[in-house]
Each structure stands twice: as C-alpha cells, then as structure tokens.
C-alpha cells in the first residue's frame, strides 16, 4: 500500500491523543534508554510504511503484536485516514486462518515497540533533516 | 464462531436519526476493537468508526460530530447512532470486530442498508 495520500495530520492526532499512550503503557517497566533505535524513516509515507511492518508483521522473537491495544488503534486510524487502506487490506486478507494466541511480552517484543516509538516520533516530526 | 449480526437501518429523511445495533457472539467485547464501516454504491468500504475495549473511540471527519459509536458490554452489542443524517450517508454499514491476526483481517457482519432520502 502506497501512504502517500493519508491525511497525516488526523494520524498524528490520533497518535498523539491515545496510541502514545498504549505504547507508552506496553513499555512500562522499561528503561527508555534499554533500547537502541535502528529502524529509521525519511518521510510520513516511509514512516507509515515501516510502522505498519512493525506493528503487524510477525519476526523471530516476537509472534504478534496485532492483539495489543495500540495496532488496533494504529489499524483503524489507518483504515479511516488513508483512501484505500482497508479495502486493499480486506482483499488481502480474505483467506486469513482466525486463531488466537495467546499475549505474550517478551524482551523482543519489547525492542520493536520501543522501535515503534521512534518510528511514531519521527513520523511526527517530518520537517526534520535525517540524522 | 464469530457471528455479527447488525439491524437498525432503514428509509430516513435527511436531518434525522437512526441507530444502527450490532449483536455479536462467539467472542466478548471486553477484549476486541469494534468497527462500522459502510459502503456505498460504486465505492470502496470504508471504516467510519471505531471503538477499543478501554472506551476510546475514532472518527472519520465525514461523520465526526454526527455519529457516536458505543459498546455495552453486558448485551454484547455495539451501537451506531447516526444523527444529521445527509444523503451521502445512504450505504450498506457493516459491523466489524478486528480480528488481530494482522492488517485489516476483520470478521465482518451481514450488512445493514441506511437510505437518507426525501
């Protein structure tokens, strides 16, 4: 899906009034300096992407984190804010198997959401020169 | 299994109201996002509102200040009240429960058809 024509503003507001906060909740307990960022983005589209990889796609260590509080956030802010996004993602999920696992935190998980923030900071932020 | 099954819609006159109801079972609400979207003919389903299990809710612009989303977990139902309504809300509006197996895998409803016309 090309992010290119979301209405960023309302994302980030809605970022900014709840899915911040979710995140910041997941992460309680947690140093903010336990994790270094390495995932980066240059732009909005670009930061929408990569948070939307991270937020839905599973990796090694850390299985889903679509249960949590803030992907469904982040999936229905896309959903309302980018033309298009829910009906290309209904087509391409038409076949998807329903099993629910069971929620479980681990350190991995933890990393990429500490990611996530960064990814979400940046995004918030797009008039900044990438360092 | 997961069924949704919406009732509510109906023939209303521009600037009045209606309240779309959705029954859900197979799940609890406590623990899902729930949706409305609505598609209108010759156009894509799009997601108008939605509401998460700690009470917080989204908005699409086309219907913020009209519509209310609300869930009452007891009854396992969750409600849309559409007040003002325009001719350009006449749609089939469908319940949807996030399915959280990843992007947009919603398990959806049967749809209910809402007609604003004089």
């Known amino acids: 899906y090309d992010f290119t024509n979301c209405d960023f503003e309302k994302i980030k507001a809605a970022y900014l009034s709840t899915i911040s906060k979710d995140l910041i909740t997941y992460m309680s307990g947690t140093k903010s300096t336990e994790f270094n960022n390495t995932v980066s983005c240059s732009n909005r589209p670009h930061c929408l992407t990569e948070i939307q990889s991270l937020t839905f796609n599973p990796t090694a260590g850390c299985a889903s984190l679509a249960k949590e509080m803030f992907a469904m956030k982040t999936k229905a802010a896309l959903a309302i804010w980018c033309p298009g996004y829910s009906e290309t993602q209904i087509n391409a999920t038409q076949a998807m198997k329903k099993r629910r696992k069971r929620k479980v935190t681990t350190n991995k998980c933890l990393e990429q959401v500490s990611q996530l923030q960064g990814l979400w900071r940046r995004f918030n932020r797009p008039l900044l020169k990438q360092q | 299994e997961v069924q949704l099954v919406e009732s509510g819609g109906g023939l209303v006159q521009p600037g009045g109201s209606l309240r779309l109801s959705c029954a859900a079972s197979?799940?609890?609400?406590?623990?899902?996002?729930m949706g409305w979207f609505r598609q209108a003919p010759g156009k894509e389903r799009e997601l108008v509102s939605a509401?998460?299990?700690?009470?917080?809710?989204l908005y699409a612009d086309s219907v913020k200040g009209r519509f209310t989303i609300s869930a009452d977990n007891s009854k396992n139902t969750a409600y849309l009240q559409m007040n003002s309504l325009k001719p350009e809300d006449t749609a089939v509006y469908y319940c949807?429960?996030?399915?959280?197996?990843?992007?947009?895998?919603?398990?959806w409803g049967q749809g209910t058809l809402v007609t604003v016309s004089s």
């Open positions: 949807a429960k996030d399915r959280d197996t990843g992007i947009g895998a919603y398990d």
């Open positions: 197979g799940f609890s609400l406590d623990y899902y996002a």
């Open positions: 509401i998460f299990s700690d009470g917080s809710a």
